[in-house]
């Protein structure tokens, strides 16, 4: 995929350019991660590569999201799996595939999910395979709540930045 | 599908009639784009019908949004695909489907991906079929940027205003 | 799925602390729903529970969202369908799901679809299976719009907060 | 290295209830099928079922259906097998599998028996 | 359910014979949408799980020597050893997957002459 690990990106210059012309003069929490491609077997998220940026607050710590200040935001998620390699052996059952945008808050203790899609994959029926999914909502979320994403098929992902990427932005 | 062709739409009603009381004060740059029904074999976008509207410096050239002013975005699209004409001889071979929004920006001399969805439909084991593509997210945009998009298997696509379009809004 | 059915959810909380620092002062009409897993047969949306609300004019009457006041608006929704029980006697006829957000408006007689995801199962073929559909976009409202939903394939939808849900927000 | 471990076997009185555990690891395990098969002493391969960790699916063999109950906990990557009303012909070698990647665990003999 | 039944239930072979073993399905494992027959052949030997060898009836599993190899479509299908080892004395199955339940053959014991 072209624009794949350019340096600097679109992301860094803004950031580095803090005098450019800016559409609006009130910055706003918002944040855009994309999977890490280096890690074939997890799901890491990065804010500092391609176009992938935080700002205004938001912070990434321990694979999640962490909201800077309270208030409504938009969160979104897209995923995308694919199978050739891997093929099924000795049954046609299908391959589970989900991706789910959790919510951890101090007034529960544990994850809330916000955001779940979820499809069967039959892998031996047809392959190669390929499946996109995306979901989105507005939440109200405190400050210090922590947004974290959580993935049955990770061995699957296409990881890439227009391909896997979790975001959210304040309203 | 009800509602299609309308003339004027809403969105036209709103540019024609300046005064009708905003929710908000300030415009923010906003566009919001269908596929034109009457082309089959391309994905040409119209902002000048239907729901369809660009507001506060967004233009629509060569078939690219373009960027008024710098800043974070979010931008988004879909497409609905389907088939039906296939032969029983096409089952072994699947059908890739894929639906990219790209940037082109003066910063790099080629197109980067934005978003990407992808799919492998096998339309002589699934006849008829249809699939639906939906992604969207936020970026650090720069005035000037151009935004487009590029689909495999736009003769499938199944085009109205509430099934292929392609938006962008400042945040 | 963990947090279902909370109360008083964050969102609730939120509305009984008004104090509680908000990331932005102009408070702007936004709107999350999601469907009542109580009504198996039937797509009932609800804004008093878990993390649903409508904020700043947004109302829910006849099972419509009625837009406070004239402007663009994002608009979203998703659902979520599964199936396990049919048999194999169905393999060769699919199941048509779709779902669609619709505007009825003051202007037109009728209700305009907004947002289309269509989608055909062949449950016999591939069973179990699971299927996601989301869709979301700007569009220009008017003050006493009415966003509703209308799905085919209701009795195969998986009801929970996460999966099945149904909002907008005021750009 | 990818393994599956099942444990939880042993000597069980005619109609009572056992419950068997099968540890993954080495590979994701949420998305791929647990297959359940046994094998009297002597005799062939049984299937009795399969569980999908991630989405809670489950598909019986007829044969078991209201006897056996399969479930799993995805954080700690383990299914289960719950067999109830045991009968002298229960006992077995059960044995769980991936199919989608060919795994078998090495099994744990189970014997209904006063 | 679909039925698997393999002949002989048991051989007596030699070190170096080339040993085939038949399995029949009461209907076809043949998907015709990717010609694949969802086929699996085990080894199992005594004490021990069994082992996958092939898979849709002729793909062999990584590591499986190749002295082993599986043919077949539809509803007819053969496991050979080309050159039977030491090692090879075994249990063997067929197993469908096609469908619901999955079924096993009864088992071919292949024993030294």
């Known amino acids: 995929l072209p624009g794949v690990g350019l340096t600097p990106s679109a992301a860094q210059t803004a950031r580095q350019h803090p005098k450019m012309h800016l559409a609006h003069s009130t910055l706003k929490p918002a944040a855009h991660l994309i999977g890490d491609p280096s890690k074939q077997n997890s799901l890491l998220w990065r804010a500092n590569t391609d176009r992938a940026f935080l700002q205004d607050g938001f912070s990434l710590s321990n694979n999640s999201l962490l909201v800077p200040t309270s208030g409504i935001y938009f969160v979104y998620s897209q995923v995308v799996f694919s199978g050739k390699a891997y093929s099924p052996k000795a049954t046609s059952s299908p391959l589970y595939l989900a991706h789910e945008v959790q919510l951890f808050s101090s007034q529960y203790p544990f994850h809330v999910p916000l955001l779940s899609s979820q499809k069967m994959v039959y892998p031996g029926l047809q392959e190669p395979w390929l499946h996109s999914m995306y979901h989105g909502a507005a939440f109200q979320l405190t400050q210090g709540d922590q947004l974290s994403t959580h993935t049955d098929g990770i061995p699957h992902l296409v990881l890439s930045p227009s391909t896997v990427f979790f975001g959210a932005f304040a309203l | 599908l009800p509602g299609v062709g309308l003339t004027p739409s809403a969105a036209q009603t709103a540019r024609q009639h300046p005064k009708m009381h905003l929710a908000h004060s300030t415009l923010k740059p906003a566009a919001h784009l269908i596929g034109d029904p009457s082309k089959q074999n391309s994905l040409l976008w119209r902002a000048n019908t239907d729901r369809a509207f660009l507001q506060d410096g967004f233009s629509l050239s060569n078939n690219s949004l373009l960027v008024p002013t710098s800043g974070i975005y979010f931008v988004y699209s879909q497409v609905v695909f389907s088939g039906k004409a296939y032969s029983p001889k096409a089952t072994s071979s699947p059908l890739y489907l894929a639906h990219e929004v790209q940037l082109f920006s003066s910063q790099y001399p080629f197109h980067v991906p934005l978003l990407s969805s992808q799919k492998m439909v096998y339309p002589g084991l699934q006849e008829p079929w249809l699939h639906s593509m939906y992604h969207g997210a936020a970026f650090q945009l720069t005035q000037g940027d151009q935004l487009s998009t590029h689909t495999d298997g736009i003769p499938h696509l199944v085009l109205s205003p509430s099934t292929v379009f392609f938006g962008a809004f400042a945040l | 799925l963990p947090g279902v059915g909370l109360t008083p959810s964050a969102a609730q909380t939120a509305r009984q602390h008004p104090k509680m620092h908000l990331a932005h002062s102009t408070l702007k009409p936004a709107a999350h729903l999601i469907g009542d897993p109580s009504k198996q047969n039937s797509l009932l949306w609800r804004a008093n529970t878990d993390r649903a609300f409508l904020q700043d004019g947004f109302s829910l009457s006849n099972n419509s969202l009625l837009v406070p006041t004239s402007g663009i608006y994002f608009v979203y929704s998703q659902v979520v369908f599964s199936g396990k029980a049919y048999s194999p006697k169905a393999t060769s006829s699919p199941l048509y799901l779709a779902h669609e957000v619709q505007l009825f408006s003051s202007q037109y007689p009728f209700h305009v679809p907004l947002l289309s995801s269509q989608k055909m199962v062949y449950p016999g073929l591939q069973e179990p299976w699971l299927h996601s559909m989301y869709h979301g976009a700007a569009f220009q409202l008017t003050q006493g719009d009415q966003l509703s939903t209308h799905t085919d394939g209701i009795p195969h939808l998986v009801l929970s907060p996460s999966t099945v849900f149904f909002g907008a927000f005021a750009l | 290295e990818v393994q599956l471990v099942e444990s939880g076997g042993g000597l069980v009185q005619p109609g009572g209830s056992l419950r068997l555990s099968c540890a993954a690891s080495g590979y994701t395990f949420s998305s791929y099928w647990i297959e359940w098969v046994r094998q009297a002493p002597g005799k062939g391969l049984e299937w009795v079922g399969e569980?999908?960790?991630?989405?809670?699916?489950?598909n019986y063999n007829e044969e078991f259906k209201g006897r056996a109950t399969f479930s799993a906990d995805n954080s700690k990557n383990t299914a289960y097998l719950q067999m109830n009303s045991l009968r002298a012909e229960d006992t077995a070698v059960y044995y769980c599998a991936d199919g989608y990647h060919g795994y078998w665990g090495q099994g744990t003999l189970v014997t209904v028996s006063s | 359910d679909i039925q698997m039944t393999q002949s002989p239930s048991s051989l007596s072979a030699s070190v170096g014979d080339r040993v085939t073993i038949t399995c029949k399905s009461s209907q076809s494992l043949l998907y015709s949408t990717n010609q694949k027959n969802f086929l699996a052949w085990y080894q199992q030997k005594p004490g021990k799980a069994p082992k996958l060898l092939i898979y849709?009836?002729?793909t062999r599993d990584s590591g499986v020597p190749s002295r082993f190899s599986g043919s077949g479509s539809g509803t007819d299908f053969t496991l050979t050893i080309s050159s039977l080892q030491p090692e090879d004395f075994a249990t063997y199955y067929c197993?469908?997957?096609?469908?619901?339940?999955?079924?096993f053959g009864q088992g071919t014991k292949v024993e030294i002459k």
């Open positions: 849709w009836a002729s």
């Open positions: 197993q469908q997957a096609y469908s619901y339940p999955r079924t």
């Open positions: 569980i999908s960790p991630g989405s809670g699916s489950t």
